[in-house]
């Protein structure tokens, strides 16, 4: 939010030199008027009258929804996740029909033992959440299951999850190579068939703050951009202060139009200001520039 600039006159001049008589209204903004009942409201840009005031659509605000906000709320998820569809073959358990029934005691016991085994296998992966058996079938026991991974959202979340999926692959390959039957017996919690380990599919949460920002900015999409602060994305226009992309209007007010951000320069009793950034001051009485 911008601080109001104390001025002694009310005229604002655009950087091109024309005087703007109604500074709060962007004359280049398309105007649509909403009429509800017999209340003719000046709700522009798709806004509607709720009986008391204009309810504005993003990215507009103001009494008549005539102004464009400087920042748009974008809310990335707190956590992001990945799901890996894996198949392993357990050789230390013989398949029985009861294992087909997910509500049977046999299935529950197998699920518990398998989960314990996988928790041991993936214990060093901070992103690891757990496993979920989707299907058991003959051979000895072919276990189709999902490995679930989760991490806090950061701009680098995809890299973190990609790295975690690689470690999962390495660890499951290692355990299914090492924990194998010897003389028809298994000394481990579970033994595996080395050749039965397959990664079928990997699904990673898709979240793109730039895309969300552009969508919400609508016709201003080319002028809103994403900047990060404390690993959190902000969808801002150049009129939002405090960011790398912020436009410095010096002696003026930043205003969004459909052609982008521009500075509306102020005129005081003693000076008028001009230039693209309102940084050229001319003293009214002496007519010389202060740079």
């Amino acid at each position: 939010p911008l601080a109001t600039i104390p001025v002694s006159t009310t005229s604002l001049t655009s950087s091109e030199g024309s005087t703007i008589s109604t500074p709060s209204v962007d004359i280049s903004t398309p105007v649509t008027t909403s009429i509800v009942g017999d209340q003719c409201s000046r709700c522009k840009n798709g806004g509607f009258w709720d009986g008391l005031k204009c309810q504005c659509l993003t990215p507009y605000y103001g009494e008549s929804c005539e102004e464009v906000v400087n920042s748009i709320d974008i809310a990335p998820p707190e956590t992001v996740s990945a799901q890996m569809e894996l198949t392993v073959t357990v050789t230390s358990v013989k398949f029985t029909d009861e294992l087909k029934n997910h509500s049977s005691q046999e299935f529950r016991e197998f699920n518990k033992t398998f989960t314990e085994q996988m928790n041991i296998v993936y214990s060093g992966i901070p992103e690891y959440v757990g496993v979920n058996i989707t299907n058991l079938r003959l051979g000895s026991v072919v276990v189709e299951h999902d490995v679930l991974l989760r991490t806090k959202y950061t701009p680098e979340y995809k890299t973190a999850l990609d790295n975690a999926t690689e470690v999962v692959k390495q660890k499951i390959t290692k355990v299914t190579t090492e924990q194998i039957m010897t003389n028809d017996n298994c000394s481990a919690l579970m033994c595996f068939n080395t050749t039965g380990t397959q990664v079928q599919n990997i699904t990673v949460t898709q979240y793109d703050p730039v895309e969300e920002c552009r969508q919400k900015a609508e016709e201003y999409e080319d002028y809103f951009l994403v900047e990060y602060r404390d690993q959190k994305p902000y969808c801002i226009s150049p009129c939002e202060s405090g960011f790398n992309a912020s436009k410095n209007c010096n002696h003026g007010k930043c205003q969004m139009s459909q052609n982008g951000a521009r500075c509306l320069c102020v005129t005081t009793e003693t000076h008028w200001y001009s230039g693209e950034d309102c940084n050229q001051g001319t003293q009214k009485s002496h007519h010389h520039h202060h740079h």
Partner: nanobody, 123 residues
Amino acid sequence: EVQLVESGGGLVQPGGSLRLSCAASGFPSSRGTMAWFRQAPGKEREGVAFINSDGRTSYAESVKGRFTISRDNAKNSLYLQMNSLRAEDTAVYYCAASLLYLMTVNAAAYPYWGQGTMVTVSS
């Protein structure tokens, strides 16, 4: 609720015999796997033998030819016949069970356990 109760332990001289029994209640003895484990003082629990629902058996190398595991499905019972006992067979013997057809003597794979019966082989 599955309950396993062992009996038959005691003091026996080296070279002697003992028969351990395990009565299983709440466990469908015609299914899954039943096993005997033992734990000697100051040592880890080790698998002695297991038997599957179809009668398939497996033994630890140290007891092969001396011990015999069997189960009576009609009586819901598991047995361990121990012959030619040695001092190193001294331990608490545990009965364990799983509803799954297991081929492992890893104790963590068995969810159901008895309280154990003490076997002492000493002259």
